[in-house]
Interface confidence: low
């Protein structure tokens, strides 16, 4: 397949990735699905540099990322290893808090108002960030 050479319209390029920043809110699963339909995924933060880039663009607003523990352990949606990877949780987070009264714990991670991460109820309608890699092979069939 061919490789992308530039980001789609309305996406922002940074370090060979393309990012799209929502201005509305969705539950985590709906945000995840939105990104997948764009041939992308919810943002996966792998470095402090990427953290600062995303933080700069979202501002002080709760925003979903591609990290969840809905099936037990914390997992990034693109398969990046959580245990050995970059983390930027707020103090005492994640805490899988049950005290919110909405049923269940907190299984989805988001950027908080200061950029650090928190786990929250996945049904909350937060903004989200999609990411796709520029050098990812496109989904078009190869030319024969």
């Amino acid at each position: 397949g061919s490789e992308r050479t530039c980001c789609p319209v309305n996406w922002v390029e940074h370090e060979r990735s393309c990012y799209w920043f929502s201005r509305s809110g969705k539950a985590w699963a709906d945000a995840d699905n939105y990104c997948r339909l764009e041939d992308a995924h919810l943002v996966v933060v792998t470095s402090w540099e990427e953290q600062k880039f995303v933080q700069h663009h979202i501002g002080p607003v709760n925003t979903w990322m591609g990290l969840h523990d809905q099936n037990g352990p914390w997992k990034w949606v693109d398969g990046t290893d959580y245990e050995t990877g970059f983390k930027n949780w707020r103090p005492e987070q994640p805490d899988d808090w049950y005290g919110h009264g909405l049923g269940g714990g907190e299984d989805c991670a988001h950027f908080t108002d200061d950029g650090r991460w928190n786990d929250d109820v996945c049904q909350r309608p937060y903004r989200w960030v999609c990411e796709t890699e520029l050098d990812k092979a496109s989904q078009e069939p190869p030319l024969l």
């Epitope: 707020r90 005492e92 805490d95 808090w97 005290g99």
Partner: antibody, heavy 121, light 107 residues
């Protein structure tokens, strides 16, 4: 430094509605991630949590008081409110407003000074 | 709801003595247990959050431990200004609840 100040009538007649205001200064009540609670303390007794409110207006009330309690917010005034209906002498207490630590599970890190409300005819 | 049982209800202690207050939860709350100090005619003040983390500005003689259902607040080398009532509070399950309090008096 966030500060909280309760205000309202110190005397309420039985069967009437108790109404209190908590004014927040030194920080915005709209700061996403904070919960704002009402807690009361009967004379010489322990603490009883009444309920909380998120800046968006979502609330959760103690089931023991749920049928009589309303907590609301006015973000433009940086205030939140407690209404407790059909009061009896058993509602005589010091009423505190308090701020929960970031993201709801860090304990109450800031309290008002409290206001005594007496229910009597 | 989660019931928090504090013991003892009352403790009379001489200065420089060690004070231990326990709080037992009726079901597991992980580390979502906090301790407050309340002096007469004052509002409660947060001392320890998350069972063992000192809140900012709290003297180092105050410490907390425990998880699950059993928690302890320790005051090492009690000072006269520590005369107060101490409350535990759980935030792990709704409704939020408090222990009944432990009054510490200076002999």
């Amino acid at each position: 430094q966030v500060q909280l100040q309760e205000s309202g009538p110190g005397l309420v007649k039985p069967s009437q509605t108790l109404s209190l205001t908590c004014t927040v200064s030194g920080g915005s009540i709209s700061n996403s991630g904070y919960y704002w609670s009402w807690i009361r303390q009967h004379p010489g007794k322990g603490l009883e949590w009444i309920g909380y409110m998120y800046y968006s207006g979502s609330t959760y009330y103690n089931p023991s008081l749920k049928s009589r309690v309303t907590i609301s917010v006015d973000t433009s005034k940086n205030q939140f409110y407690l209404k407790l209906s059909a009061v009896t002498a058993a509602d005589t207490a010091v009423y505190y407003c308090a701020k929960g630590g970031y993201n709801w599970n860090n304990g109450f890190d800031c309290w008002g000074q409290g206001t005594l409300v007496t229910v009597s005819s | 709801e989660i019931v928090l049982t504090q013991s003892p209800d009352f403790q009379s202690v001489t200065p420089k003595e060690k004070v231990t207050i326990t709080c037992r939860a009726s079901q597991s709350i992980g580390s979502s247990l906090h301790w407050y100090q309340q002096k007469p005619d004052q509002s409660p003040k947060l001392l320890i959050k998350y069972a063992s983390q000192s809140f900012s500005g709290v003297p180092s003689r105050f410490s907390g431990s425990g998880s699950g259902t059993d928690f302890t607040l320790t005051i090492n080398s009690l000072e006269a200004e520590d005369a107060a009532t101490y409350y535990c509070h759980q935030s792990g399950r709704l409704p939020l609840t408090f222990g009944g309090g432990t009054k510490v008096e200076i002999k």
